[in-house]
Each structure stands twice: as C-alpha cells, then as structure tokens.
C-alpha cells in the first residue's frame, strides 16, 4: 500500500436546503483505470461511512441506488454533493481515495471537509 | 427498547389550549429529531412540525404558524406540543415521531411513533 | 407549498395480486421520500425509507422505487394483513409533507 495525498477544503456551509457540496482532488503517481471513493464523517470521536463509489476513470461515480452522495468526476478531481443534511449531520467529512487497478494500490485520506449545517429557524415554511 | 410514550386523552372547548406530552426512553434522546404529526377522525396524516432536541429549535408547517409551540425537557427526554387557539377541526389523534440525522448508520426516519393522544375540542 | 399526490385514492386486490401505488411530487425531491402502512385503527408503520431502503422487519413483498418527482411503492404478491391505508412522505426537509393516502382494500 502506497501513500498519495488528498486535498478538500477546510469548511463549507451546506445550503438551505440541506446540500453540501465540495471538491475530493488526489495526487495520482501513475495512470489509474479505477479508483475508489469514499466519504467518512468524524463527530464526537466515531468515524462512520457515509458514501463509497468505485468508477473508471472518464465515466459517472456510480453509488447506490439509496447513497445520499453524487458525484462527479474530472481527472484527479471528484466534485461530491451529500443531500438530506441537517443540523445533527454538522461534522468532519473525510474524502478517502483508493487507486485500485492497475497495481500498485495508491491510499490516500483527506485532512476533512468541516460541514456545517444549520436547521431554518421558524417561519412561514417554504421549502428549506 | 425504543419506547415513545404519550400523555393520555384531552376534551377541550374551543379557544382553550392543550399541550401533548411524548417521552422518550430506550435511546440517545438529544441523538434523534421528534416530529409531531396529527389525523383527524377519518382522515390522512398531516406534519405540523420538527424539534431538535439537541438545540430545542423547531420548525413548523405554515398552517400552524402561530398556534403552535415545541418544546424539549433534556432532563426528562420529554418534547411537548402546544396548540392555542383551538377550534372543533383541531379533533384529532396526536402523534410524535423520532427521527435520526441521514447520516446515522442504519437510522431510518420516522421509525417509531408515540401510541397517539386523541385530543377532542368541543364546546 | 410542495405537494404530494398519491394515486390511485383507492383500490381493490386479490390476495396475491401485484400492486402498484404512486406517489407525484410537485418538485424535485431526489430520493428523500418514505412509505407507510397504516392499518385500520393503529399507528403508521414505516415501509420504505429514501425511496428504495426497505425498513428492517419489512417484508420483502414490499419494494420502493422511483427519484425526483415520481415514486412507487409496489406489492409483489398481496396478503390479507395488507389491507390498509398506505402514504408517502417527503423527508428531511420541511415541509415534512404526506400525501393524501391510498386506501387498499381486499377483494
């Protein structure tokens, strides 16, 4: 297992209406086919999965039918969008890339994107 | 067990206020959002609103907006439900429902509802 | 508001008919939509989570499909138990909204 570093940003701010999105970008030391794509979530010590998608390189991120993750990809970047966030999904949101064929097998883990997530105050409730 | 226990029966007259009771036991209690969710006799399930027992903020359903109020006792995993102003098309079953943030491992929305309340309004 | 329309309102089955019940959205929604079962006189059971997601201790006659505006909650094969009103529900943002329920009756 090889090393290869990830960069995400910092922090963002999901929408109002509960979507975040934010850009996975890795190293790659040679020429992948596929790659592995997974997001993790930090809060209060646990570490938990919350989306994983393997793709080929030039086609969609394919991730299951209930993921509440899409994606996208354009060379060593991956563009993510997670949906359904509320306050309680605030947390670190770690991008974790694997460089599965052809050998050798690349990891590569993100520092974590902050999300933060804010519930609508009351008021006359459009759609938030 | 998940258990989301419910104050019992209300009969009151119109313009009287009531407040509906939902403790938690058997979880995470500030871990989950609660819902209040209502059915009038014979009819469909209507939202009126969502508090986070973590913040005690909530929002409610627009046709609410006003009349009703959620609030969250920690010490009790107890959320309450007030609704003022109330008028004969209030009749109905009360219920509460938790509900887990999307990115809780194999949490499913609304997966437990309190035994329901019947609050009856008549003069 | 958003709105929910379910169809058909209502309906009448065989025991061991396939049936289908859909569910409209008036906006996208992605696949953050529930189903449930409520039988007469109880409280509502929740079937299906995120459009797909059968909800643990389910059977497996019931199955979820459909994203954006456009939903259906199928039966494989009809049992007596069934009889009952079924509604979907957007979730994970409000308005937290049912649709108007469909009543299912066994022939």
């Known amino acids: 297992c090889k090393a290869m570093h990830v960069a995400q940003p910092a922090v963002v701010l999901a929408s109002s209406r509960g979507i975040a999105s934010f850009v996975c970008e890795y190293a790659s030391p040679g020429k992948a086919t596929e790659v592995r794509v997974t997001v993790l979530r930090q809060a209060d010590s646990q570490v938990t999965e919350v989306c994983a998608a393997t793709y080929m390189m030039g086609n969609e991120l394919t991730f299951l039918d209930d993921s509440i993750c899409t994606g996208t990809s354009s060379g060593n970047q991956v563009n993510l969008t997670i949906q359904g966030l509320r306050a309680m999904d605030t947390g670190l949101y770690i991008c974790k890339v694997e460089l599965m064929y052809p050998p050798p097998y690349y990891l590569g883990i993100g520092n974590g994107t902050q999300i933060y997530v804010i519930d609508p105050e009351p008021c006359p409730d459009s759609d938030f | 067990q998940v258990q989301l226990v419910q104050s019992g029966a209300e009969v009151k007259k119109p313009g009287a206020s009531v407040k509906v009771s939902c403790k938690s036991s058997g979880y995470t209690f500030t871990s989950y959002y609660m819902h209040w969710v209502r059915q009038a006799p014979g009819q469909g399930l209507e939202w009126m609103g969502i508090?986070?027992?973590?913040?005690?903020?909530?929002t409610y359903a627009q046709k609410f907006q006003g009349r009703v109020t959620m609030t969250r006792d920690t010490s009790t995993s107890t959320v309450y439900m007030e609704l003022s102003v109330l008028r004969s098309e209030d009749t109905a079953v009360y219920y509460c429902?938790?509900?887990?943030?999307?990115?809780?491992?194999?949490?499913?929305?609304?997966?437990?509802w309190g035994q329901g309340t019947l609050v009856t309004v008549s003069s | 508001d958003i709105q929910l329309t379910q169809s058909p309102s209502s309906l009448s089955a065989s025991v061991g008919d396939r049936v289908t019940i859909t569910c409209r959205v008036s906006?996208?929604?992605?696949?953050?939509l529930n189903w449930y079962r409520q039988k007469p006189g109880e409280i509502p059971k929740l079937l299906i989570y995120r459009a797909s997601s059968l909800q643990s201790g389910v059977p497996s006659r019931f199955s979820g499909s459909g994203s954006g505006t456009d939903f259906t909650l199928t039966i494989t094969s009809l049992q007596p138990e069934d009889l009952a009103t079924y509604y979907c529900?957007?979730?994970?943002?409000?308005?937290?909204?049912f649709g108007q329920g469909t009543k299912l009756e066994i022939k």
């Open positions: 508090i986070n027992p973590s913040s005690g903020g909530s």
């Open positions: 529900q957007r979730t994970y943002s409000a308005p937290y909204t």
């Open positions: 429902a938790r509900d887990p943030p999307i990115t809780m491992v194999r949490g499913a929305p609304f997966d437990y």
């Open positions: 906006q996208d929604i992605s696949r953050l």
